[in-house]
């Protein structure tokens, strides 16, 4: 699994790079699964999409997402994993030209086709949690995380730091 050690590896990479803002520090392909090991599958067509959160069949290939890692341009007092008070942020893309977006009004996670530079809604602060898990906090709405609700991805408000370990906002990243 790509958890604590992986996040630390890319956090360390910040020291070796002066790149900030619109250029990613590094990119990484990984399958995304929930804390309970349900797979996340992205079913995109030109005019529609669906994101499945479910137990994947044994013989089926896991979808992968391209995670692009960025260093936040602005120092932060938030709890995001980073270096020198800066946060590590990611964008998540399941296929070329499409990215996960936070729709804070609808509390939903959406897929949008867009060109770079990506809007702020496509950026998530990466948190390195326990048990080799990570969580994704909306850049546009601190305290709101990508989570699982009714077998779908949704935006979930986390009231206190104690709730940061709630299972429905924890995800696993794996190379396989």
């Amino acid at each position: 699994a790509f958890g604590i050690s992986g996040v630390q590896k890319y956090t360390r990479a910040l020291h070796d790079s002066s790149i900030t803002g619109i250029s990613p520090i590094t990119e990484y392909l990984a399958s995304l699964s929930t804390y309970n090991d349900q797979s996340i599958t992205f079913a995109l067509e030109d005019e529609s999409y669906e994101i499945y959160v479910e137990d994947l069949k044994k013989d089926e290939k896991k979808d992968k997402v391209l995670l692009s890692y960025y260093e936040s341009q602005h120092p932060s007092n938030e709890s995001g994993d980073g270096v020198d008070g800066k946060m590590l942020m990611v964008t998540l893309s399941p296929t070329k030209d499409f990215w996960l977006h936070a729709n804070n009004k609808e509390h939903s996670v959406e897929l949008h086709k867009c060109e770079k530079p990506l809007p702020d809604q496509a950026f998530f602060v990466l948190h390195n949690m326990h048990s080799n898990c990570v969580s994704f906090e909306c850049k546009t709405d601190p305290g709101v995380f990508i989570g699982v609700k009714d077998n779908h991805l949704a935006l979930i408000k986390v009231d206190s730091s104690e709730n940061l370990c709630t299972e429905n906002i924890l995800f696993k990243l794996s190379e396989t």
Epitope: E60, K61, T95, K96
Partner: antibody, heavy 126, light 106 residues
Framework: EVQLLESGGGLVQPGGSLRLSCAAS????????MSWVRQAPGKGLEWVSG????????YYADPVKGRFTISRDNSKNTLYLQMNSLRAEDTAVYYC???????????????????WGQGTTVTVSS | SYVLTQPPSVSVSPGQTASITCSGE??????AAWYQQKPGQSPVLVIY???KRPSGIPERFSGSNSGNTATLTISGTQAIDEADYYC?????????FGGGTKVTVL
């Protein structure tokens, strides 16, 4: 509206060659894996070959390996099937089919064949 | 190579339920799809991912898959449902189809 239009079929002698084309429209062609599926007269469907995003991601059924070559030209929204060393048992209607979903970074073909062309007939006979 | 086995034919009276089976080793570990093909026409996807219907496919078509068998069920069968039906799976980036089942509406 998704449209797939095959062409290039015809009568060819055993050992001969044919090149089939499939012109695609109504969707972002480069985003989808594509396949060729054939159907011999009075028989069932048989998957022939598939292609994902580039020339390295090609897949073939055992009966056509080494004889058929699948390719695509994303600038022309066209899928191809080059068929060499044709045999009588290759006689069939050849359908071009698009994967239901866009390709994912995991690579390979994706789920079922969501859209089909009308087919082009290939007859191998002396 | 992976083999999917279907009954050659199934007969059903109008309004009744037709069930078509598709058997393969550990079929339930794969996602099954079903295609309808009417004479002289191209195949049409009617079920994918075991149970899901593409837009435009009537609700009377449903699917299930467990163990070694996937099943396509047509509830309240109509005359227009008379066709050949093929199951299919994707196995290691290779397409596999069953031999097809001719559904006759009596």
């Amino acid at each position: 509206e998704v449209q797939l239009l095959e062409s290039g079929g015809g009568l060819v002698q055993p050992g001969g060659s044919l090149r089939l084309s499939c012109a695609a429209s109504g969707f972002t062609f480069s985003s989808y894996a594509m396949s060729w599926v054939r159907q011999a007269p009075g028989k069932g469907l048989e998957w022939v070959s598939g292609i994902a995003d580039d020339f390295t991601s090609t897949y073939y059924a055992d009966p056509v390996k080494g004889r058929f070559t699948i390719s695509r030209d994303n600038s022309k929204n066209t899928l191809y099937l080059q068929m060499n060393s044709l045999r009588a048992e290759d006689t069939a209607v050849y359908y071009c089919a698009r994967d239901l979903w866009m390709m994912n970074y995991a690579g390979g073909l994706r789920y079922p064949f969501g859209y089909w062309g009308q087919g082009t007939t290939v007859t191998v006979s002396s | 190579s992976y083999v999917l086995t279907q009954p050659p034919s199934v007969s059903v009276s109008p309004g009744q339920t037709a069930s078509i089976t598709c058997s393969g080793e550990r079929m339930g570990d794969k996602y099954a799809a079903w295609y309808q093909q009417k004479p002289g026409q191209s195949p049409v996807l009617v079920i994918y991912r075991d149970t899901k219907r593409p837009s435009g496919i009537p609700e009377r078509f449903s699917g299930s898959n467990s163990g070694n068998t996937a099943t396509l069920t047509i509830s309240g069968t109509q005359a227009i449902d008379e066709a050949d039906y093929y199951c299919g799976v994707l196995k290691q980036d290779t397409g596999v189809f069953g031999g097809g089942t001719k559904v006759t509406v009596l």
